[in-house]
Interface confidence: low
């Protein structure tokens, strides 16, 4: 027959290879049925029998067809400081990630080996970088004109308010306090985030102020109504 | 015990490439950022730049043309290297250990290394 | 870039004297921070957040102001305290020091 409708085991041409979902087994030198995910090879094949799958046992798994001899166990239950994103099946590992207000700190293939709590911000700092799956927050001092007043593991430096009459002027972790009724928010650009200095990960030629309702950018010149061009020498 | 140490010291001539690696111990690169600070002869301390706890890195607008700031968390090494140097590059490189969410101070440091910059 | 201006640049001091000495900023920050170095030694952190000592610095340490005027002040010079002092701003881009304060003793 030819090896496109030949039936399982069959020997392979010179020089060919077996098909989709099939396998060479070395030893009866023929083309063989892989098993499918979720089972495994419970008996594998002869010159003149085919692969015999079984189904895998409670906690093991197997994700992709194959034709190992026992399924892979699940992974360990998730500690306390992860949620189990997807759970063990026979066809897939169990898979931990970290709880919210968290970050992975030590990554395996799949979730998280090692979580950790995202480090907070105590007043007068604000997030610089904002936490993801994978990183800790980082904090920069509030830059003059700003505040934080909160200790977060989200909160960025914000402006001061402006007052008409200043009662009690502001610092970097606390607000301007005002006499009058009508306060209003500094506007000036890149306020809201603490100037540093130029990053790489910058898309920029040269940096420039992030828009503000992107409160995770903080690649910024110092706050100010005309941040200087790269390379300038003034104040 | 938490320590830094720079490779070196090192000789370099005009217009080569100068590379140090800071390797750290006591401490893991994936919870603190460590700076790179010079100190020329008889002079005071200049800052170059930072790479941070996440990899990030962001440099002094005077050496961002030259200067690339690395690391190898799992080994706990950071690598330096500036380009084109000069013999007004000529100083004592020190990297610094900071924590991105603590006091903010540079508050361990390496011995530092010479770089003499001379055809 | 944010200038700042130590004085004096070098000033010496009798064991027991009260010393001072000044890092103005060309224009506001928030915190300083100050370093001390001795010859052939790194520098260290010696306060920080403007007015906290690092650990292990005498109390007769104490730093202070806001704005663009900080100051370092030794209530008691002693010997040891002989070295040179740095300040220290990342309140804009890029963070800098002063050029420093040699201290001397008497």
């Known amino acids: 027959l030819p090896a496109q409708v030949a039936f399982t085991p069959y020997a392979p041409e010179p020089g060919g290879t077996c098909r989709l979902r099939e396998y060479y087994d070395q030893t009866a030198q023929m083309c063989c049925s892989k098993c499918p995910p979720g089972q495994h090879a419970k008996v594998f094949c002869t010159k003149t029998s085919d692969t015999v799958c079984d189904s895998c046992e409670d906690s093991t798994y197997t994700q992709l067809w194959n034709w190992v001899p026992e399924c892979l166990s699940c992974g360990s239950r998730c500690s306390s400081d992860q949620v189990e994103t997807q759970a063990c099946t026979r066809e897939q590992n169990r898979i931990c990630t970290c709880r919210p207000g968290w970050y992975c700190a030590l990554s395996k293939q799949e979730g998280c080996r090692l979580c950790a709590q995202l480090r907070k911000c105590r007043p007068g700092f604000g997030v610089a970088r904002p936490g993801t799956e994978t990183s800790d927050v980082v904090c920069k001092p509030c830059a003059p004109g700003t505040f934080s007043n909160t200790t977060s593991s989200t909160d960025i430096c914000r402006p001061h308010q402006i007052c008409h009459v200043v009662a009690i002027p502001g610092n970097a972790s606390m607000d301007a306090v005002c006499t009058s009724t009508s306060p209003t928010r500094s506007m000036a650009p890149g306020a809201v985030h603490l100037p540093q200095p130029v990053s790489t990960r910058s898309q920029h030629t040269q940096p420039t102020p992030a828009p503000s309702t992107a409160p995770g950018t903080s690649f910024l010149l110092p706050v100010g109504p005309s941040p200087p061009a790269e390379g300038s020498t003034g104040d | 015990e938490v320590q830094l140490q720079e490779s070196g010291p090192v000789l370099v001539q005009p217009s080569q490439s100068l590379s140090i690696t800071c390797t750290v111990s006591?401490?893991?690169?994936?919870?603190?950022?460590v700076h790179w600070v010079r100190q020329s002869p008889g002079k005071g301390l200049e800052w170059l730049g930072v790479i941070w706890s996440d990899g990030g890195t962001d440099y002094s607008a005077a050496f961002i043309s030259r200067l690339s700031i690395s690391k190898d968390n799992s080994k706990s090494q950071v690598f330096f290297k500036m380009n084109s140097l000069q013999a007004d590059d000529t100083a004592i490189y020190y990297c610094?250990?900071?924590?991105?969410?603590?006091?903010?101070?540079?508050?361990?440091w390496g011995q530092g290394t010479t770089v003499t910059v001379s055809s | 870039e944010i200038v700042l201006t130590q004085s004096p640049a070098l000033m010496s001091a009798s064991p027991g004297e009260k010393v001072t000495m000044t890092c103005s900023a060309s224009?506001?920050?928030?915190?300083m921070y100050w370093y001390q170095q001795k010859p052939r030694s790194s520098p260290k952190p010696w306060i920080y957040?403007?007015?906290n000592l690092a650990s292990g610095v005498p109390a007769r340490f104490s730093g202070s102001g806001s704005g663009t005027s900080y100051s370092l002040t030794i209530s008691s010079m002693e010997a040891e305290d002989a070295a040179t002092y740095y300040c220290?701003?990342?309140?804009?881009?890029?963070?800098?020091f002063g050029a420093g304060t040699k201290l001397e003793i008497k």
């Open positions: 224009s506001s920050v928030s915190y």
């Open positions: 610094a250990r900071n924590d991105d969410g603590g006091d903010y101070a540079m508050d361990y």
């Open positions: 006591g401490f893991s690169l994936t919870s603190y950022s």
């Open positions: 220290q701003q990342w309140s804009s881009n890029p963070l800098t």
């Open positions: 957040l403007t007015s």
